[in-house]
């Protein structure tokens, strides 16, 4: 069973009075409809809430929306609908919040049928004031901010035009027509695909990939026969149609599309897909769908150039293009990812990797749990985590797994303990070591969130009945206190806390229902008085990440280095504070074969750390295509894992020679790529 709420279990003294003084109710003067909430900036306390209400009439839909603003983390809200002239805001575009602390907000308004273009409301002062701007086009997508300059916006129109603004939406210019997909790259570069004949759909596989580095003054075609493209870390990927048939292959560029290499990945057919699961500046996780409607594929991990791939995980669950996968980056510990596989008997099992996809294992059974009915052996089973797929299947799972970079080691997730994921009502489990060990934290499904960098965990039971109780823990989920935040229960719709898990405020959203009306209501609880004092040195203890064998000198070595963290002692009830920075100390490890992936033409037999030559390539010269040139590879089969920092120890030899020969790629070679200026 989960830890109880015994009288003495980590009891926080006088917490009811402390929380009661810091609980703020706000009733919204609205019919229910829908509500969306956005945080504006970081540590500003500014929240925007948009409520919308639709009344379907015979010929048209009548809509009303209201905009509210809080500048104290949701304790008080002010109706600012008049700042946007009481205009109905289109919820499908949401609120476009600017990057970093720019304070910029764009709201897209609903306009009447015959208008020449859309309308937006812009704010650059954290929604204190808005400027109405009429657009020369009807937007198809939300405005996208350049990550480098929040004054630069791009949007696609319903006519497939690519529009750019250089002055935060004041003036717009159409820089290209017939555009399917557009994305900001680095340095204010825009990548986009265009069609020549009929439409995006009709030209799929015959699209062109373009680039502009000067917001539309000049362009360069960087690819043809494009099916789709994506950006991940420092990599630009494109799936390209093969010349002879309907298959396509991934090509990769690390220089913004100037030169391309064919990724050493299987080609896919019409019904299959590629998906970038995760990417950083070192490497990429790529899912390649299996032929047929199997619902699974293979995960491959790349080398540092995104070209050579190692098979990482078979039978990886991923339903259809744009469908569901449980792939989750555990952001609270470097190198950890969790996902699901579809086993031969069609049951779904959870797998975890601690070394960035090098090896996958089942999750260790929680100490305080029994194996369920799915287990053949009642003493041997694993924890299986519910994520996106379970949610899409309408299982009783209100939330996906949760981890935060500044709450080191903490992972919270719904799960079941057995041989596979169970359709029974799940419980909530917590790991304090990045997924190595797990404990049942709460009985039954809950909503949960992390506050104060892990100093507080808050949970609310998932129930169809109205609720008025919140649970909180100050010791990483071991002991729980319950607090009744209102006498009148509400129909709960969501928990909201400032992204980044640094806040000590939590907002509980829901609605009240009476005979005639229902109204939105929020309760914001500030936990600052529960954590009365600031944490001091004595409140922290040392933690070696990835520690599995304390006797071993190389204990904790993952990707060539180990990291020591200062972590809050579970028993310390104090504030990490908004300015808390994770204190860590890395130390380099000696290289072993584990620090190398198998090079092109080599593979690792199961349960072996040595790379052996692929039988079909034995005795052949290893030649492959790189940047449009033929390369000859002299290797003993190893290549350092991207991001691996090991030094000394094992050092396999590797040499690449340029054969000075062109090699065929389905891409335009760099010489043939054309440029044009507007």
């Amino acid at each position: 069973s989960a830890p109880g709420e015994d009288e003495e279990c980590g009891r926080v003294r006088d917490f009811v009075a402390k929380l009661a003084n810091n609980t703020h109710q706000h009733v919204f003067d609205d019919l229910r409809g829908s509500v969306s909430l956005s945080w504006v900036g970081d540590s500003t306390g500014v929240i925007l809430v948009l409520t919308t209400f639709h009344v379907p009439l015979v010929i048209m839909t009548f809509g009303q929306s209201k905009l509210y603003r809080s500048e104290d983390y949701g304790k008080n809200f002010k109706d600012i609908t008049d700042l946007i002239n009481n205009t109905f805001i289109r919820t499908e575009f949401g609120m476009a919040i600017g990057p970093e602390n720019s304070g910029k907000v764009v709201l897209t308004a609903e306009v009447s049928g015959g208008s020449r273009g859309g309308r937006i409301f812009r704010s650059s002062d954290f929604a204190k004031n808005f400027v109405q701007t009429d657009l020369p086009f009807h937007p198809l997508t939300q405005m996208m901010y350049s990550p480098q300059n929040s004054d630069y916006l791009l949007a696609l129109s319903t006519e497939n035009g690519l529009w750019v603004s250089k002055n935060f939406g004041g003036k717009w210019e159409e820089i290209h027509k017939a555009v399917c997909l557009a994305k900001w790259g680095s340095d204010n570069t825009i990548f986009f695909t265009t069609y020549a004949n009929g439409s995006c759909k009709a030209d799929l596989g015959a699209l062109e990939l373009w680039r502009t580095s000067d917001l539309g003054k000049s362009f360069k075609t960087i690819g043809v026969k494009i099916y789709s493209f994506g950006l991940g870390g420092r990599f630009l990927f494109a799936s390209v149609m093969a010349d002879k048939d309907t298959t396509r292959r991934i090509h990769v560029s690390t220089d913004q599309g100037d030169t391309w290499s064919m990724a050493q990945l299987p080609s896919v057919g019409q019904e299959q897909f590629y998906s970038i699961l995760a990417a950083n500046d070192d490497m990429v996780f790529m899912h390649v769908d299996e032929p047929g409607d199997t619902g699974f594929g293979t995960i491959f991990t790349s080398d540092d150039r995104g070209i050579v791939y190692s098979k990482s995980l078979d039978r990886h669950l991923y339903t259809t293009t744009g469908g569901e996968t449980d792939f989750t980056n555990v952001t609270s510990l470097r190198g950890v990812y969790i996902t699901s596989v579809l086993s031969e008997d069609n049951s779904i099992q959870t797998m975890i990797t601690f070394d960035q996809g090098g090896r996958w294992t089942h999750l260790r059974k929680p100490e305080n749990s029994e194996c369920d009915a799915t287990a053949k052996n009642k003493n041997e089973c694993s924890l299986h985590i519910h994520a996106s797929y379970s949610i899409s299947q309408k299982l009783n799972v209100p939330m996906a797994p949760l981890s935060e970079p500044n709450a080191v080691g903490i992972v919270i997730a719904h799960g079941s303990v057995g041989d596979a994921i169970s359709v029974m009502v799940p419980d909530v489990y917590i790991s304090d070591d990045g997924g190595y060990s797990w404990t049942k934290m709460l009985e039954g499904p809950h909503y949960y969130t992390i506050l104060d960098s892990g100093g507080i965990i808050v949970a609310i039971e998932h129930s169809s009945r109205p609720i008025n109780v919140i649970k909180f823990s100050t010791d990483e989920g071991q002991c729980w206190q319950t607090y009744t935040f209102t006498r009148d229960p509400i129909y709960f719709t969501g928990l909201a806390s400032e992204p980044g898990a640094r806040s000590m405020n939590i907002s509980i959203w829901g609605f009240t229902e009476s005979f005639l009306t229902s109204q939105w209501v929020s309760y914001t609880i500030d936990f600052k008085d529960i954590l009365e004092r600031n944490c001091e040195e004595k409140d922290y203890t040392i933690w070696l990440a990835h520690s599995t064998d304390p006797e071993d000198y190389e204990d904790g070595c993952i990707l060539g280095y180990k990291e020591q963290f200062l972590r809050l002692r579970k028993s310390s009830v104090c504030q990490n504070g908004r300015d808390y920075v994770v204190t860590k100390q890395p130390s380099i490890c000696l290289c072993s074969l584990e620090d190398f992936l198998c090079d092109f033409g080599y593979y690792r037999p199961e349960n072996d750390s040595k790379c052996v030559e692929q039988p079909e390539l034995k005795g052949h010269d290893l030649e492959f295509c790189l940047y449009g040139r033929e390369e000859h590879l002299t290797t003993n089969g190893y290549r350092k894992i991207p991001g691996d920092k090991c030094q000394g120890g094992v050092n396999p030899v590797r040499e690449v020679k340029d054969l000075k020969k062109k090699c065929t790629s389905n891409f335009l070679s760099p010489e043939k790529q054309n440029s044009k200026s507007n």
């Epitope: 980590g10 203890t541 933690w543 070696l544 028993s571």
Partner: antibody
Amino acid sequence: QVQLVQSGAEVKKPGSSVKVSCKASGGTFSNYAISWVRQAPGQGLEWMGRIIPIFGIANYAQKFQGRVTITADKSTSTAYMELSSLRSEDTAVYYCARDRRGFSGYEVFDYWGQGTLVTVSS
Amino acid sequence: DIQMTQSPSSLSASVGDRVTITCRASQGISSWLAWYQQKPEKAPKSLIYATSSLQSGVPSRFSGSGSGTDFTLTISSLQPEDFATYYCQQYNSYPITFGQGTRLEIK
């Protein structure tokens, strides 16, 4: 196998200082906190303080604050405890101890030095 | 500081007996309690952490229970090598404190 080897017994005069060393071998010294615990003849155990060598953080029990200094030398995997202004009631066996678990809030001492007897006598 | 009080201070028992030692904290310490065994002229040895978790290599006849302020160490069937002094230790908050010890002697 982890071992904590302490320096030999000391006889000190009241008012003087003593510095006891604790050398770790097996495993990595920097991975853990080292605590110092003392035990007066026929008495119980008393925690004096701890150091986290890799971060250079030391904390002391209020009772010893100002009289005790705990340091560590990462290059030699050695921790030190210096107690000043010695009085007769400081006569005790001084142990260094290490927590094998590293975290989960556990300051549970799985590894102990053999102890160093410090006798304070005029 | 949190005071830890053990009882009894000493007790006599025979091989095969079931023995219980209690430890009371002056304020709630959740489950942050450990038990140690110490033999004459030797350093203490860790038996139990987090109230009830057995350290590896410790015989299963040792068990711990309790929470908050009241805790017990139980030896289900005394063996000759179990005659020693036992200490409880709280690590809920600094300074870490120990009980005064319980001396377990052969009857």
